[in-house]
């Protein structure tokens, strides 16, 4: 279930899709990648209080027990909830080929 | 690509299944769940220092912008990458029924 | 407007050369690549190749290895497929497409040119 | 490199018929295909990106659905304007290929 999309901490604080700028040095992928040479990596980042956008009955469980035992049991964690692919131009012994991975971009979040 | 399962941070502090002892009353199941009265709840806890277990492209990319931007960028998170179901016996407005839920126990755990 | 507008019409006999082109307008030209698709008459659609117009890097299908070239001026947004001798067969519309890496689609087309060759 | 089959190659429905359209890679290729629409002396048109995506401004009626070898695109209530040769199209690696195409024609 989908839980509240409403954050209590303010705008913005909560889980949420984020845009962060990279090149390939950034990533790391300088010696295999050729294109593109800049990447907006697309991820979620925010906090998970009590029940925003709970991914499901486990989320909702971590969220109890963590109230309960904040030094044992972590919050629930922003994550992935599915993602876009993305298309890389990259160096094979061959020569050069292209190549779609379907989890490097996050598409929409959730706290799990 | 499931990453190395090497914990360079000592045994048992990373990323892993855990199991914390949970009443009813704990869940906030009391009022619906009849049975059982304590579950044993498996969950993932633990850190997720460079590469370990990382569950796939993204998480590797959450890495290294972590190392970038720190306090930008969180590291990946351990969460569950599948669960195992379990049966609660639950009250409903005839009576009691038998219910499975798919996404309550963590089974295993990986970084993203 | 986000649009890719392509080379007229062309009727070419065997063993001439030809160079058509495809200009896109309305977007950042290097943020995107172009591929070119092929159909001849009255058949489906092939995929010929694609181009990073920002490095120049090119990936061709086998099947259009040393047939043909394509090339980007990135200076006037504008993309190139190419023969140096073309056969009858090389008959067909041929499609520029953006392609959007975020997402991995073909999004915008061009109108498409027909090449014809015929002695 | 991967082949793409479409079946039927042909169909003959009625506006209001549900359509189903299927395409089957020669191995997996993920969630990494496309379905493009192509009218007669026109371009193709984007329709569904990531197997099950639907592109901006293509109407609801348009789903698609599968993920590894087998998908599917549907047209829930085939409208006039659907009229036209629908393929599919793999972009898991290169060299990518599109399917051979399916010709919905009006009963």
């Known amino acids: 279930a989908r839980n509240g999309d409403h954050c209590p901490l303010g705008p913005g604080r909560c889980c949420r899709l984020h845009t962060v700028r990279a090149s390939l040095e950034d990533l790391g992928w300088a010696d295999w990648v050729l294109s593109p040479r800049e990447v907006q990596v697309t991820m979620c980042i925010g906090a998970c209080p009590s029940q925003f956008r709970a991914a499901n009955m486990h989320a909702q469980i971590k969220t109890s027990l963590h109230r309960l035992k904040p030094d044992t049991v972590p919050a629930p964690c922003c994550v992935p909830a599915s993602y876009n692919p993305m298309v890389l131009i990259q160096k094979t012994d061959t020569g050069v080929s292209l190549q779609t991975y379907d989890d490097l971009l996050a598409k929409d979040c959730h706290c799990i | 690509a499931r990453n190395g399962d090497h914990c360079p941070l000592g045994p048992g502090r990373c990323c892993r299944l855990h199991t914390v002892r949970a009443s009813l009353e704990d869940l906030g199941w009391a009022d619906w769940v009849l049975s059982p009265r304590e579950v044993q709840v498996t969950m993932c806890i633990g850190a997720c220092p460079s590469q370990f277990r990382a569950a796939n492209m993204h998480a590797q990319i959450k890495t290294s912008l972590h190392r970038l931007k720190p306090d930008t960028v969180p590291a990946p998170c351990c969460v569950p990458a599948s669960y195992n179901p379990m049966v609660l016996i639950q009250k409903t407005d005839t009576g009691v029924s038998l219910q499975t839920y798919d996404d309550l126990l963590a089974k295993d755990c990986h970084c993203i | 407007e986000v649009q890719l507008v392509q080379s007229g019409a062309e009727v070419k006999k065997p063993g001439e050369s030809l160079k058509i082109s495809c200009k896109g307008s309305?977007?950042?030209?290097?943020?995107?690549?172009i591929s070119w698709v092929r159909q001849m008459p009255g058949k489906g659609l092939e995929w010929m190749g694609i181009?990073?117009?920002?490095?120049?890097?090119?990936i061709y299908s086998p099947s259009f290895q040393g047939q043909v070239t394509i090339s980007a001026d990135k200076s006037i947004s504008t993309a190139y497929l190419q023969w140096s001798s073309l056969k009858a067969s090389d008959t067909a519309m041929y499609y520029c497409?953006?392609?959007?890496?975020?997402?991995?689609?073909?999004?915008?087309w061009g109108q498409g040119t027909l090449v014809t060759v015929s002695s | 490199d991967i082949q793409m089959t479409q079946s039927p190659s042909s169909l003959s429905a009625s506006v209001g018929d549900r359509v189903t359209i299927t395409c089957r890679a020669s191995?997996?290729?993920?969630?990494?295909l496309n379905w493009y629409q192509q009218k007669p002396g026109k371009a193709p048109k984007l329709l569904i990106y990531?197997?099950?995506n639907l592109q901006s401004g293509v109407p609801s009626r348009f789903s698609g659905s599968g993920s590894g070898t087998d998908f599917t695109l549907t047209i829930s209530s085939l409208q006039p304007e659907d009229f036209a040769t629908y393929y599919c199209?793999?972009?898991?690696?290169?060299?990518?290929?599109f399917g051979q195409g399916t010709k919905v024609e009006i009963k």
């Open positions: 309305g977007y950042s030209f290097t943020d995107y690549w």
């Open positions: 990531a197997a099950s």
């Open positions: 191995q997996s290729i993920s969630n990494n």
């Open positions: 181009i990073d117009p920002s490095g120049s890097y090119t």
């Open positions: 199209f793999q972009l898991d690696h290169s060299p990518f290929t």
């Open positions: 497409a953006r392609v959007s890496y975020y997402g991995g689609y073909f999004d915008i």
